[in-house]
């Protein structure tokens, strides 16, 4: 028998520095977690103690903090090289800055293979990108070899900016021939490493003949055997065992997100490459693990540029950006409109001639808007200003909801109106009329939404049974501010870009902004 240790991360999302327990900015260092310096300490400790170790990443290193905004992926290549990752799969967020924003900072600089079997380049891009990422890589580990085959969510064209010259094929269809190729090369230990979410990970384990282990990402799935060490609630045991169609027991793992945990899986193979046993658990990277001093020093060196960036002008406003709680928790506020417009703009994807865009709607809890921006400071808007407006380090995500769920959400928005509570919704691509004289749960008298399958966008009444795409904060997707109906009834949820980054990019693009209050939210019967 031969034993392999798989160390794995996924959805790190630019958390190079240690973070608080909820993966936001570290405040009290003695209680902070994760970060590449701490990760390196643990990885090195395991490499010294165990003979056959692979360090793998299942995608979405890109996007999530000011580190990515400023360094645009160069930080990912630099620190992943420093940690000596063995392989990485491409995630959807790796395409956030377009294909060039993947090729130059990461693909050309990484000293480890970057993988995806289901992304096929065409046209002029084919010769430019081919060979910079691979469908599979065979890695020597001790006296054996392990094949790693990569995959990426086929939804990436709707979630990011891969352009028109990359085709995202069905994961299972694309993986099988690559695994078959590895088999013809006499590789009998094969790991599928990818970024399509836990449901697809399980399907790959079930359907792709020859895959021995699946290491996944995208869904931020936390698996754990025994008592979990922090706040995350396990979605199942670690590893999660899937019985394949050909009768094999295939371990499937994921390691939550944000570099908070290091996945740790031990696999025992027989000489034919069959999995005999698998066990392990994610390791919580808490403050009991010291940060490696050399990596920490490097982080501090790279940090200097971030501090300078925070105070640079992104663009100008010629109007007061009203982000006060007195406005945004009671009525339409122009800060809410600005943020929602930025959220839609960030999700412009012309992937189908029938649709002007795949999504037109935005909702945003008023309680998430934490500060106004005064235009009387020469109109200057900085990252620092935006960090005061959106201080929680969240993401603006894409969900699919039925019209009936949206209606419930808007009823919840005003169910206890007047108490300055955070659930009052700011909107984009939606016209809503409330009648506060009616009883809670029956106050939405008009709800019109902007069409997507149209060449000239116009507002149509919401249809209860129709499925709509909506951009919203991850806080709402997770049921925050009492929006349990969104969490319970959403049909799909894909995590998006860092909130501040979305707004800063929009302001930089527009250069000068002047959002108005324009009648997106109205109150009838003279109650307002």
């Amino acid at each position: 028998a031969w034993e392999l240790t798989i160390l794995h991360t996924n959805d790190v999302h630019s958390r190079l520095e240690q973070t608080s327990e909820d993966s936001s900015k570290c405040v009290n260092a003695s209680r902070c977690m994760g970060g590449v310096a701490r990760l390196f300490t643990k990885v090195q400790q395991i490499r010294r103690a165990e003979p056959n170790v692979l360090l793998l990443d299942a995608g979405d290193q890109y996007q999530g903090t000011i580190w990515f905004t400023v360094y645009k992926g160069a930080e990912v290549a630099h620190f992943m090289n420093a940690l000596r990752y063995d392989a990485m799969a491409l995630g959807n967020h790796e395409f956030d800055n377009g294909v060039e924003g993947l090729i130059e900072p990461l693909l050309k600089e990484a000293k480890f293979p970057i993988l995806s079997a289901n992304i096929k380049a065409k046209g002029p891009l084919a010769s430019q990108i081919s060979g910079l990422y691979l469908p599979y890589k065979v890695l020597p580990v001790g006296d054996e070899v392990v094949g790693i085959v990569g995959y990426t969510s086929k939804e990436t064209p709707f979630l990011s900016n891969p352009g028109t010259n990359l085709v995202f094929e069905d994961e299972i269809t694309a993986l099988q021939p690559e695994v078959d190729k590895l088999k013809t090369l006499n590789v009998n230990k094969i790991i599928a490493l990818g970024h399509s979410g836990f449901e697809m990970d399980k399907l790959i384990a079930q359907k792709v003949r020859g895959v021995d282990v699946v290491v996944g990402g995208h869904s931020n799935t936390f698996l754990y055997t025994g008592n979990p060490p922090s706040k995350e609630v396990p979605a199942g045991k670690y590893p999660f065992i899937v019985t394949s169609d050909d009768g094999r027991k295939v371990p499937v793992v994921q390691a939550y997100a944000f570099g908070k945990y290091l996945g740790y899986l031990k696999i025992e193979f027989d000489e034919r490459g069959n999995v005999i046993s698998s066990h392990g658990n994610p390791i919580l990277l808490n403050s009991s693990i010291p940060e490696d001093p050399s990596i920490k020093a490097d982080i501090n060196k790279w940090r200097i540029k971030l501090d300078n960036y925070s105070t640079q002008e992104l663009g100008k406003t010629i109007v007061y950006l009203d982000g006060s709680s007195q406005s945004c928790r009671f009525r339409e506020c122009n800060m809410g409109n600005l943020i929602c417009d930025a959220m839609i703009n960030n999700n412009l994807r012309h992937t189908d001639e029938m649709f002007w865009n795949h999504v037109s709607m935005c909702i945003l809890n008023g309680g998430g808007i934490r500060s106004p921006i005064d235009e009387r400071n020469n109109g200057t808007i900085t990252w620092e200003n935006l960090a005061a407006v959106l201080p929680f380090g969240g993401t603006f995500d894409l969900v699919q909801l039925k019209g009936s769920t949206l209606k419930k959400a808007f009823e919840h928005s005003v169910h206890r109106y007047g108490q300055s509570t955070g659930e009052f919704l700011q909107v984009g691509g939606i016209h809503v009329v409330y009648d506060l004289s009616r009883k809670p749960g029956d106050r939405v008298v008009k709800l019109d939404v902007l069409c997507t399958k149209c060449r000239v966008p116009s507002y149509d009444p919401l249809k209860m049974d129709e499925v709509y795409k909506v951009i919203l904060p991850n806080f709402l997707a997770n049921g925050g501010d009492g929006f349990q109906m969104i969490k319970d009834e959403l049909l799909r949820h894909d995590s998006g870009d860092q909130d501040i980054n979305v707004v800063s990019t929009y302001i930089s693009k527009m250069k000068v902004i002047y959002p108005a209050v324009e009648g997106r939210i109205k109150f009838s019967t003279g109650s307002h």
Epitope: K120, A126, S130, G131, L134, P135, V138, P140, D143, E144, V145, D180, K181, L182, T184, L185, N186, V187, N188, E271, R272, G273
Partner: antibody, heavy 117, light 107 residues
Framework: QAYLQQSGAELVRPGASVKMSCKAS????????MHWVKQTPRQGLEWIGA????????SYNQKFKGKATLTVDKSSSTAYMQLSSLTSEDSAVYFC??????????WGQGTSVTVSS | DIQMTQSPASLSASVGETVTITCRAS??????FAWYQQKQGKSPQLLVY???TLAEGVPSRFSGSGSGTQFSLKINSLQPEDFGSYYC?????????FGSGTKLEIK
């Protein structure tokens, strides 16, 4: 430094079989695939197949299935190729080569096989 | 099977010159690709792997480029010891196939 030593030239009759050897030294024999390649002036270099000494797994070019049989002896770090039912078309130089999944990085000196009556 | 089309079949050049040999794959083979040099009566020797990485001990006047379907081997400032035959090869699954070879001769 890896080194592959192949057995000497063979002169064989049509219809007969021949078994040639490739002795490996300077590396862990069981950790690398051993590939076999045929060279003739007419066809150039042709890949025959490969064997993984660790467990004996083989992979063959369809064209040489039934013609070539690959085996190993782990105790002596030696790979073997047997060619059966020989014809003049099988007259060639046969190379063994170590494959490290990036390329064939070390080659034997070749075994010349002449099939003649 | 993947076909490897190599050109030219033969090439005459003088010491000090620069030459380029090309190889085209019948389908995308990413960078699962290598170049070999073979001298008369000897076995092939690895020159370049992963399309552009020089094998150990190979002089820097050799360089490989390309990916996908188009590959090339460039030899700057030819030396007497560079004359011989050159072969390209893919290893994107089996069967591996080789190009038909380029014979580089002294002019």
């Amino acid at each position: 430094q890896a080194y592959l030593q192949q057995s000497g030239a063979e002169l064989v009759r049509p219809g007969a079989s021949v078994k040639m050897s490739c002795k490996a030294s300077g590396y862990t024999f069981t950790s690398y695939n051993m590939h076999w390649v045929k060279q003739t002036p007419r066809q150039g270099l042709e890949w025959i197949g490969a064997i993984y000494p660790g467990n004996g797994d083989t992979s063959y070019n369809q064209k040489f299935k039934g013609k070539a049989t690959l085996t190993v002896d782990k105790s002596s770090s030696t790979a073997y190729m047997q060619l059966s039912s020989l014809t003049s078309e099988d007259s060639a130089v046969y190379f063994c080569a170590r494959y490290d999944y990036d390329a064939m990085d070390y080659w034997g000196q070749g075994t010349s096989v002449t099939v003649s009556s | 099977d993947i076909q490897m089309t190599q050109s030219p079949a033969s090439l005459s050049a003088s010491v000090g010159e620069t030459v380029t040999i090309t190889c085209r794959a019948s389908e995308n083979i990413y960078s699962y690709f290598a170049w070999y040099q073979q001298k008369q009566g000897k076995s092939p020797q690895l020159l370049v792997y992963n399309a552009k990485t020089l094998a150990e001990g190979v002089p820097s006047r050799f360089s490989g480029s390309g990916s996908g379907t188009q590959f090339s081997l460039k030899i700057n400032s030819l030396q007497p010891e560079d004359f011989g035959s050159y072969y390209c090869q893919h290893h994107y699954g089996t069967p591996f196939t080789f190009g038909s070879g380029t014979k580089l001769e002294i002019k």
